[in-house]
Protein backbone atom coordinates (compact mmCIF):
# COMPACT_ATOMS: atom_id res chain seq x y z
CA UNK A 1 0.00 0.00 0.00
CA UNK A 2 1.20 3.51 -0.75
CA UNK A 3 1.98 6.16 1.81
CA UNK A 4 3.13 9.78 1.65
CA UNK A 5 6.65 10.74 2.77
CA UNK A 6 7.96 14.32 2.89
CA UNK A 7 11.48 15.72 3.06
CA UNK A 8 13.07 19.11 2.33
CA UNK A 9 14.01 19.89 -1.27
CA UNK A 10 17.51 21.22 -0.55
CA UNK A 11 20.04 20.94 2.28
CA UNK A 12 23.56 22.31 2.42
CA UNK A 13 26.09 20.12 4.20
CA UNK A 14 28.29 21.69 6.85
CA UNK A 15 31.99 22.33 6.24
CA UNK A 16 32.62 19.10 8.12
CA UNK A 17 30.56 17.11 5.63
CA UNK A 18 27.50 16.64 7.83
CA UNK A 19 23.94 17.07 6.57
CA UNK A 20 20.71 16.69 8.53
CA UNK A 21 17.07 16.72 7.54
CA UNK A 22 13.69 15.47 8.72
CA UNK A 23 11.80 12.76 6.87
CA UNK A 24 8.12 12.82 7.77
CA UNK A 25 5.69 10.11 6.75
CA UNK A 26 1.92 9.67 6.80
CA UNK A 27 0.77 8.77 10.29
CA UNK A 28 1.99 5.36 11.32
CA UNK A 29 -1.26 4.63 13.15
CA UNK A 30 -0.58 1.35 14.92
CA UNK A 31 2.68 0.60 13.12
CA UNK A 32 5.01 -1.02 15.64
CA UNK A 33 8.03 -1.56 13.44
CA UNK A 34 9.25 0.97 10.90
CA UNK A 35 12.17 0.71 8.49
CA UNK A 36 13.84 3.84 7.20
CA UNK A 37 16.20 3.61 4.22
CA UNK A 38 18.30 6.42 2.79
CA UNK A 39 18.89 6.09 -0.94
CA UNK A 40 21.18 8.18 -3.13
CA UNK A 41 20.20 8.79 -6.71
CA UNK A 42 22.93 9.57 -9.21
CA UNK A 43 21.61 9.65 -12.73
CA UNK A 44 19.48 6.57 -13.22
CA UNK A 45 21.29 4.66 -10.51
CA UNK A 46 19.95 4.31 -6.96
CA UNK A 47 22.24 3.11 -4.16
CA UNK A 48 21.45 2.45 -0.51
CA UNK A 49 23.37 4.76 1.81
CA UNK A 50 22.08 3.34 5.08
CA UNK A 51 19.02 1.77 6.67
CA UNK A 52 17.58 1.28 10.13
CA UNK A 53 14.59 -0.42 11.68
CA UNK A 54 13.01 0.89 14.83
CA UNK A 55 10.01 0.00 16.94
CA UNK A 56 7.61 2.18 18.86
CA UNK A 57 9.30 0.81 21.98
CA UNK A 58 12.85 1.73 20.95
CA UNK A 59 14.93 4.52 19.48
CA UNK A 60 16.07 4.51 15.88
CA UNK A 61 19.21 2.41 15.64
CA UNK A 62 21.59 2.37 12.69
CA UNK A 63 24.49 -0.06 12.53
CA UNK A 64 27.57 1.12 14.39
CA UNK A 65 29.60 1.38 11.19
CA UNK A 66 26.85 3.32 9.38
CA UNK A 67 27.43 6.76 7.88
CA UNK A 68 24.02 7.75 9.22
CA UNK A 69 22.59 8.52 12.63
CA UNK A 70 19.03 9.35 13.46
CA UNK A 71 16.32 9.85 16.01
CA UNK A 72 12.64 9.04 15.74
CA UNK A 73 9.61 10.73 17.20
CA UNK A 74 6.15 9.66 16.15
CA UNK A 75 5.98 9.84 12.36
CA UNK A 76 9.12 11.98 12.01
CA UNK A 77 12.68 10.75 11.61
CA UNK A 78 15.60 13.13 11.97
CA UNK A 79 18.38 11.82 9.75
CA UNK A 80 22.02 12.85 9.75
CA UNK A 81 24.55 11.78 7.13
CA UNK A 82 28.23 12.14 7.97
CA UNK A 83 31.49 12.01 6.06
CA UNK A 84 30.13 13.73 2.96
CA UNK A 85 32.54 15.03 0.31
CA UNK A 86 31.90 17.15 -2.79
CA UNK A 87 31.52 13.98 -4.84
CA UNK A 88 28.71 13.04 -2.45
CA UNK A 89 26.55 15.85 -3.77
CA UNK A 90 23.30 14.37 -5.03
CA UNK A 91 19.66 13.54 -4.45
CA UNK A 92 19.05 11.65 -1.20
CA UNK A 93 15.70 9.89 -1.02
CA UNK A 94 14.03 8.83 2.20
CA UNK A 95 12.11 5.56 2.00
CA UNK A 96 9.82 4.54 4.87
CA UNK A 97 8.27 1.11 5.28
CA UNK A 98 5.67 0.26 7.93
CA UNK A 99 6.73 -3.32 8.46
CA UNK A 100 4.57 -4.63 11.30
CA UNK A 101 1.81 -5.35 12.04
CA UNK A 102 0.15 -5.87 8.65
CA UNK A 103 -0.81 -4.29 6.35
CA UNK A 104 2.55 -3.26 4.85
CA UNK A 105 2.86 0.36 3.74
CA UNK A 106 5.72 1.99 1.84
CA UNK A 107 6.38 5.63 1.11
CA UNK A 108 9.20 7.46 -0.68
CA UNK A 109 9.97 11.13 -0.47
CA UNK A 110 10.77 13.22 -3.54
CA UNK A 111 14.37 13.48 -2.40
CA UNK A 112 16.59 16.06 -0.76
CA UNK A 113 19.33 17.58 -2.91
CA UNK A 114 22.36 17.73 -0.63
CA UNK A 115 25.10 20.10 -1.70
CA UNK A 116 28.55 19.38 -0.35
CA UNK A 117 31.38 21.87 -0.76
CA UNK A 118 34.79 20.62 0.22
CA UNK A 119 36.60 23.22 2.36
CA UNK A 120 39.54 24.99 0.71
CA UNK A 121 42.82 23.69 2.11
CA UNK A 122 44.46 26.20 4.44
CA UNK A 123 47.45 27.95 2.85
CA UNK A 124 50.83 27.03 4.30
CA UNK A 125 52.06 29.57 6.81
CA UNK A 126 55.73 30.27 7.47
Amino acid sequence: KGMHAAQPAVVLASSRGVASFVCEYGSSGNAAEVRVTMLRQAGSQMTEVCAATYTVEDELAFLDDSTCTGTSSGNKVNLTIQGLRAMGTGLYICKVELMYPPPYYVGMGNGTQIYVIDPEPCPDSD
Epitope: S27, S28, G29, N30, A32, E33, R35, T53, T55, V56, E57, M99, Y100, P101, P102, Y104
Partner: antibody, heavy 116, light 112 residues
Protein backbone atom coordinates in the same frame (compact mmCIF):
# COMPACT_ATOMS: atom_id res chain seq x y z
CA UNK B 1 1.96 4.29 34.53
CA UNK B 2 0.38 2.29 31.74
CA UNK B 3 -2.82 0.48 32.67
CA UNK B 4 -5.62 -1.42 30.99
CA UNK B 5 -8.68 -1.62 33.22
CA UNK B 6 -11.55 -3.89 32.20
CA UNK B 7 -15.19 -3.81 33.24
CA UNK B 8 -16.46 -6.14 35.95
CA UNK B 9 -17.84 -9.69 35.82
CA UNK B 10 -20.98 -10.35 33.79
CA UNK B 11 -23.80 -12.87 34.27
CA UNK B 12 -25.93 -13.32 31.17
CA UNK B 13 -28.52 -15.67 29.73
CA UNK B 14 -28.14 -17.48 26.41
CA UNK B 15 -29.31 -15.27 23.55
CA UNK B 16 -28.46 -12.01 25.34
CA UNK B 17 -25.75 -9.48 24.43
CA UNK B 18 -22.76 -8.39 26.48
CA UNK B 19 -20.36 -5.49 26.00
CA UNK B 20 -17.02 -5.59 27.79
CA UNK B 21 -14.89 -2.45 28.09
CA UNK B 22 -11.13 -1.95 28.33
CA UNK B 23 -10.01 1.52 29.41
CA UNK B 24 -6.41 2.46 28.63
CA UNK B 25 -4.34 5.07 30.45
CA UNK B 26 -0.73 6.23 30.61
CA UNK B 27 -0.05 6.25 26.85
CA UNK B 28 -1.39 7.55 23.54
CA UNK B 29 -4.31 5.21 22.89
CA UNK B 30 -4.26 5.52 19.09
CA UNK B 31 -0.60 4.49 18.77
CA UNK B 32 -1.08 0.83 19.67
CA UNK B 33 -3.37 -1.96 18.48
CA UNK B 34 -5.77 -3.46 21.02
CA UNK B 35 -6.13 -7.22 21.01
CA UNK B 36 -8.70 -9.51 22.62
CA UNK B 37 -7.92 -12.95 24.05
CA UNK B 38 -10.37 -15.59 25.30
CA UNK B 39 -9.69 -18.09 28.07
CA UNK B 40 -12.39 -20.68 28.76
CA UNK B 41 -12.42 -22.15 32.30
CA UNK B 42 -9.40 -24.42 32.79
CA UNK B 43 -8.32 -23.92 29.17
CA UNK B 44 -5.57 -22.09 27.32
CA UNK B 45 -5.40 -18.67 25.67
CA UNK B 46 -7.14 -18.10 22.34
CA UNK B 47 -6.44 -15.05 20.16
CA UNK B 48 -9.74 -13.48 19.06
CA UNK B 49 -8.38 -10.64 16.95
CA UNK B 50 -7.42 -7.00 17.20
CA UNK B 51 -8.61 -3.52 16.37
CA UNK B 52 -6.45 -0.80 14.87
CA UNK B 53 -7.04 2.05 17.31
CA UNK B 54 -5.98 4.62 14.70
CA UNK B 55 -8.21 3.54 11.82
CA UNK B 56 -10.83 1.58 13.76
CA UNK B 57 -10.37 -1.41 11.45
CA UNK B 58 -10.96 -4.76 13.19
CA UNK B 59 -9.37 -8.12 12.34
CA UNK B 60 -11.11 -11.26 13.61
CA UNK B 61 -9.88 -14.83 13.92
CA UNK B 62 -12.17 -17.23 12.03
CA UNK B 63 -13.86 -18.56 15.20
CA UNK B 64 -14.87 -15.04 16.17
CA UNK B 65 -16.43 -13.80 12.95
CA UNK B 66 -20.15 -13.03 13.09
CA UNK B 67 -21.38 -12.63 16.68
CA UNK B 68 -18.32 -10.74 17.91
CA UNK B 69 -17.57 -7.06 17.40
CA UNK B 70 -14.64 -4.86 18.42
CA UNK B 71 -15.24 -1.13 18.71
CA UNK B 72 -13.64 2.02 20.10
CA UNK B 73 -14.46 5.18 21.96
CA UNK B 74 -11.24 7.00 21.16
CA UNK B 75 -12.09 10.13 23.15
CA UNK B 76 -12.33 7.96 26.26
CA UNK B 77 -9.31 5.76 25.35
CA UNK B 78 -11.58 2.74 25.57
CA UNK B 79 -11.91 -0.42 23.49
CA UNK B 80 -14.99 -2.64 23.56
CA UNK B 81 -15.77 -6.27 22.88
CA UNK B 82 -19.42 -7.02 22.16
CA UNK B 83 -20.79 -10.56 21.92
CA UNK B 84 -24.28 -11.02 20.52
CA UNK B 85 -26.65 -13.97 20.87
CA UNK B 86 -24.64 -15.45 23.73
CA UNK B 87 -24.03 -19.19 23.83
CA UNK B 88 -22.86 -21.44 26.66
CA UNK B 89 -19.46 -21.83 24.97
CA UNK B 90 -18.89 -18.07 25.32
CA UNK B 91 -18.47 -18.56 29.07
CA UNK B 92 -14.86 -17.50 29.65
CA UNK B 93 -12.52 -14.80 30.88
CA UNK B 94 -11.80 -12.18 28.23
CA UNK B 95 -8.57 -10.18 28.25
CA UNK B 96 -7.65 -7.04 26.34
CA UNK B 97 -3.95 -6.63 25.58
CA UNK B 98 -1.96 -3.81 24.00
CA UNK B 99 0.29 -4.94 21.16
CA UNK B 100 3.29 -3.38 19.50
CA UNK B 101 5.72 -6.17 18.59
CA UNK B 102 4.62 -8.01 21.76
CA UNK B 103 2.02 -7.85 24.56
CA UNK B 104 3.61 -6.09 27.52
CA UNK B 105 0.32 -4.83 28.96
CA UNK B 106 -2.84 -6.80 29.69
CA UNK B 107 -6.16 -6.00 31.30
CA UNK B 108 -7.08 -7.89 34.47
CA UNK B 109 -9.68 -9.92 32.60
CA UNK B 110 -13.48 -9.90 32.58
CA UNK B 111 -15.29 -13.10 33.54
CA UNK B 112 -18.44 -13.81 31.57
CA UNK B 113 -20.87 -16.40 32.92
CA UNK B 114 -23.60 -17.63 30.59
CA UNK B 115 -26.36 -19.53 32.34
CA UNK B 116 -30.07 -19.98 31.90
CA UNK C 1 -3.88 -21.19 10.41
CA UNK C 2 -0.53 -21.74 12.12
CA UNK C 3 -0.85 -24.42 14.79
CA UNK C 4 1.49 -23.98 17.75
CA UNK C 5 2.21 -27.25 19.54
CA UNK C 6 3.80 -27.15 22.99
CA UNK C 7 5.48 -30.07 24.75
CA UNK C 8 5.30 -31.30 27.38
CA UNK C 9 1.76 -30.55 28.58
CA UNK C 10 2.95 -30.77 32.17
CA UNK C 11 6.51 -30.40 33.45
CA UNK C 12 7.20 -31.49 37.05
CA UNK C 13 10.49 -30.03 38.34
CA UNK C 14 12.41 -29.64 41.56
CA UNK C 15 13.35 -26.12 42.62
CA UNK C 16 16.83 -25.31 41.29
CA UNK C 17 16.46 -27.66 38.31
CA UNK C 18 16.66 -26.63 34.69
CA UNK C 19 13.39 -26.70 32.76
CA UNK C 20 12.94 -26.79 29.00
CA UNK C 21 9.70 -26.23 27.07
CA UNK C 22 9.35 -26.86 23.35
CA UNK C 23 7.08 -25.05 20.90
CA UNK C 24 6.66 -26.18 17.29
CA UNK C 25 4.79 -24.30 14.59
CA UNK C 26 3.00 -26.06 11.74
CA UNK C 27 4.78 -23.79 9.24
CA UNK C 28 7.63 -21.31 9.27
CA UNK C 29 6.80 -18.21 11.30
CA UNK C 30 9.39 -15.96 9.72
CA UNK C 31 7.54 -12.78 8.79
CA UNK C 32 8.02 -11.07 5.41
CA UNK C 33 10.50 -8.60 6.93
CA UNK C 34 12.76 -11.40 8.14
CA UNK C 35 11.73 -11.18 11.78
CA UNK C 36 10.19 -14.02 13.76
CA UNK C 37 7.46 -12.80 16.11
CA UNK C 38 7.61 -15.66 18.58
CA UNK C 39 6.90 -14.82 22.21
CA UNK C 40 6.69 -16.62 25.55
CA UNK C 41 4.24 -15.73 28.32
CA UNK C 42 3.77 -16.98 31.87
CA UNK C 43 0.32 -17.06 33.44
CA UNK C 44 -0.10 -17.68 37.15
CA UNK C 45 -3.47 -18.78 38.57
CA UNK C 46 -6.00 -15.92 38.64
CA UNK C 47 -3.62 -13.52 36.87
CA UNK C 48 -3.15 -12.07 33.40
CA UNK C 49 -0.30 -13.47 31.28
CA UNK C 50 3.11 -11.81 31.66
CA UNK C 51 5.58 -11.33 28.80
CA UNK C 52 8.93 -13.10 29.21
CA UNK C 53 10.54 -13.35 25.75
CA UNK C 54 9.87 -11.65 22.41
CA UNK C 55 11.24 -12.20 18.91
CA UNK C 56 12.44 -15.68 19.87
CA UNK C 57 15.28 -14.74 22.21
CA UNK C 58 14.90 -11.19 23.55
CA UNK C 59 14.20 -10.98 27.27
CA UNK C 60 11.60 -8.39 28.20
CA UNK C 61 12.75 -5.75 30.69
CA UNK C 62 12.70 -6.97 34.28
CA UNK C 63 12.68 -10.66 33.31
CA UNK C 64 15.44 -12.57 35.17
CA UNK C 65 18.33 -13.86 33.07
CA UNK C 66 17.56 -17.44 34.07
CA UNK C 67 14.95 -17.30 31.28
CA UNK C 68 16.24 -17.75 27.75
CA UNK C 69 14.61 -18.36 24.39
CA UNK C 70 16.06 -19.93 21.26
CA UNK C 71 15.09 -21.51 17.96
CA UNK C 72 14.26 -20.63 14.36
CA UNK C 73 11.85 -21.46 11.57
CA UNK C 74 9.41 -23.86 13.20
CA UNK C 75 11.24 -25.06 16.31
CA UNK C 76 11.51 -22.97 19.49
CA UNK C 77 12.57 -23.55 23.08
CA UNK C 78 12.18 -21.74 26.38
CA UNK C 79 14.76 -22.64 29.03
CA UNK C 80 14.72 -21.79 32.73
CA UNK C 81 18.19 -22.43 34.09
CA UNK C 82 17.31 -22.69 37.81
CA UNK C 83 13.61 -22.94 38.59
CA UNK C 84 12.37 -20.81 41.47
CA UNK C 85 8.99 -21.04 43.22
CA UNK C 86 7.81 -17.83 41.50
CA UNK C 87 8.31 -19.47 38.09
CA UNK C 88 5.48 -21.96 38.58
CA UNK C 89 2.45 -21.52 36.36
CA UNK C 90 1.41 -22.10 32.75
CA UNK C 91 3.76 -21.08 29.92
CA UNK C 92 2.41 -20.19 26.49
CA UNK C 93 4.23 -19.61 23.24
CA UNK C 94 2.63 -17.22 20.75
CA UNK C 95 3.22 -16.43 17.10
CA UNK C 96 2.46 -12.97 15.78
CA UNK C 97 3.85 -13.51 12.29
CA UNK C 98 0.88 -14.87 10.38
CA UNK C 99 -2.73 -13.78 10.90
CA UNK C 100 -4.59 -15.28 12.66
CA UNK C 101 -2.00 -14.99 15.41
CA UNK C 102 -2.04 -18.06 17.63
CA UNK C 103 -1.07 -19.30 21.09
CA UNK C 104 0.33 -22.70 21.94
CA UNK C 105 -1.76 -24.97 24.17
CA UNK C 106 0.30 -24.22 27.27
CA UNK C 107 2.76 -26.08 29.49
CA UNK C 108 2.15 -26.30 33.21
CA UNK C 109 5.34 -26.02 35.25
CA UNK C 110 4.77 -27.62 38.66
CA UNK C 111 6.69 -28.94 41.63
CA UNK C 112 7.76 -32.59 41.42
Amino acid sequence: QIQLVQSGPELKKPGETVKISCKASGYTFTNYGMNWVKQAPGKGLKWMGWINTYTGEPTYADDFKGRFAFSLETSASTAYLQINNLKNEDMATYFCARRSIYYPYWGQGTTLTVSS
Amino acid sequence: DVLMTQTPLSLPVSLGDQASISCRSSQSIVYSNGNTYLEWYLQKPGQSPKLLIYKVSNRFSGVPDRFSGSGSGTDFTLKISRVEAEDLGVYYCFQGSHVPWTFGGGTKLEIK
